[in-house]
Amino acid sequence: SSPTSSASSFSSSAPFLASAVSAQPPLPDQCPALCECSEAARTVKCVNRNLTEVPTDLPAYVRNLFLTGNQLAVLPAGAFARRPPLAELAALNLSGSRLDEVRAGAFEHLPSLRQLDLSHNPLADLSPFAFSGSNASVSAPSPLVELILNHIVPPEDERQNRSFEGMVVAALLAGRALQGLRRLELASNHFLYLPRDVLAQLPSLRHLDLSNNSLVSLTYVSFRNLTHLESLHLEDNALKVLHNGTLAELQGLPHIRVFLDNNPWVCDCHMADMVTWLKETEVVQGKDRLTCAYPEKMRNRVLLELNSADLDCDPILPPSLQTS
């Protein structure tokens, strides 16, 4: 069988290429109630069964575990710890299982876990140590290479009194455990900003998806250290312009492809550098589709077709001449 055929959805074959600890080791061919198991495909599917906790009697052979569409609510520490450990588990999909809390060490004792999908769970409480497992300043490296966290933002009334962006970033950076992470998807999370230190501490990233958020600016974000970055998805945000520093950093990444569609670009004098860059660069995919949203007179104009004469700023009037 082959690896997962899509980066963000697990196939029934081996990925890529692969609660209290149970007292009794499960029988090799045992399959938990409400689940479907295939030893040949090393796959267990417990899908849309309204499970409220992770089954304790998972077979030791499991490589791909689907626990989607359940009602798990809380993922406690050691939720997948077993005796013997689930040493082969490489792909874990928990999407759409109504998780609102993931506690410290929830994924401990999974030495081969390469892919984790927590998408479509309203994570009001994601422990800073959910992925690192400990509060040490430097934790043991996590084996994760792909982390899918699309649409994990809880409804406004369920959020803690803290920045949601900050909560997610704290979990990504704790203990520097995710140094080997290659794919990170954070789409559809209402992010208003990207904390400036997050990317610098994920040096192995090859694919970063920040699409369908509310990012207004990348001014304080540095991409300089992401020398392996191959795709950067920034579609469907609230970006108005990319400034020189960002443009230079993106241009300096050797393998990058950037996706910028459906942002409300402001085509005034501040856009001149970006337009010049767009005309010369090959890193932006579909750059001919980028259009102005503001000011009104420029709406729907194609960025690539603009020249410096088009990009003016209304003079700022001294206070005495300003009208209400």
């Epitope: 082959s2 690896p3 055929s5 980066a7 995919q285």
Partner: antibody, heavy 120, light 107 residues
Framework: QVQLVQSGAEVKKPGASVKVSCKAS????????MHWVRQAPGQGLEWMGR????????NTNQKFKDRVTMTRDTSISTAYMELRSLRSEDTAVYYC?????????????WGQGTLVTVSS | DIVMTQSPSFLSVSVGDRVTITCKAS??????VAWYQQKPGQAPKLLIY???DRYTGVPDRFSGSGSGTDFTFTISSLQAEDVAVYYC?????????FGGGTKLEIK
């Protein structure tokens, strides 16, 4: 099952060009990178470059930058590699190989290889 | 480019013996190393990736270890069908590069 089937052997003269095709089946073509790796007779493996089937973006080994073009046709799930200005040292078996978007450069399935002989 | 130095280049071993091949990278490549097997007249086959992950369907007599610059590939008990050339490859940075290969034959 996954298969990568390459075009047949070619004999070319120095200075000519060769275009090798690789038809994929048994998986979603646009979910995997397609790479080209060559192996001279009795020698090791050398990565030439890759193409991203979903957008056609390429990443090429600097050694071949000026001579190689990698393309794909998603409608027929086929990748192509054209090598120009052939010289005798380009005589090799040329393989296409796929990788996931995450592993990037681990090649889990390979074509059967296409022998290109460059001789005057 | 990162240079992968593989040793030995040739190995003659008896069936049932343990086989160890090493690969040294010219700079740290984390755990981004794969091992391939190539039999005569065939394309290479992926055996190990991320230094130690066994690819689907690969017998458990094949294993890999290492991180940083030093990597080891092991066949715990050589079988006759394991006669082949084995290559290491780094996936840390582009261009990916291969070791020179280790030709394994039965004594």
């Amino acid at each position: 099952q996954v298969q990568l089937v390459q075009s047949g052997a070619e004999v070319k003269k120095p200075g000519a060009s060769v275009k090798v095709s690789c038809k994929a089946s048994g998986y979603s073509f646009t979910d995997y990178y397609m790479h080209w790796v060559r192996q001279a007779p009795g020698q090791g493996l050398e990565w030439m470059g890759r193409v991203s089937p979903n957008n056609g973006a390429t990443n090429t080994n600097q050694k071949f930058k000026d001579r190689v073009t990698m393309t794909r046709d998603t409608s027929i799930s086929t990748a192509y590699m054209e090598l120009r200005s052939l010289r005798s040292e380009d005589t090799a078996v040329y393989y296409c190989a796929r990788s996931t978007m995450i592993t990037s450069y681990y090649f889990d399935y390979w074509g059967q290889g296409t022998l290109v002989t460059v001789s005057s | 480019d990162i240079v992968m130095t593989q040793s030995p280049s040739f190995l003659s071993v008896s069936v049932g013996d343990r086989v160890t091949i090493t690969c040294k990278a010219s700079q740290s490549v984390s755990t981004d190393v794969a091992w391939y097997q190539q039999k005569p007249g065939q394309a290479p086959k992926l055996l190990i990736y991320f230094a130690s992950d066994r690819y689907t369907g690969v017998p458990d007599r094949f294993s890999g270890s290492g991180s940083g610059t030093d990597f080891t590939f092991t066949i715990s008990s050589l079988q006759a069908e394991d006669v082949a050339v084995y290559y290491c490859q780094q996936d840390y940075s582009s261009p990916p590069t291969f070791g020179g290969g280790t030709k394994l034959e039965i004594k």
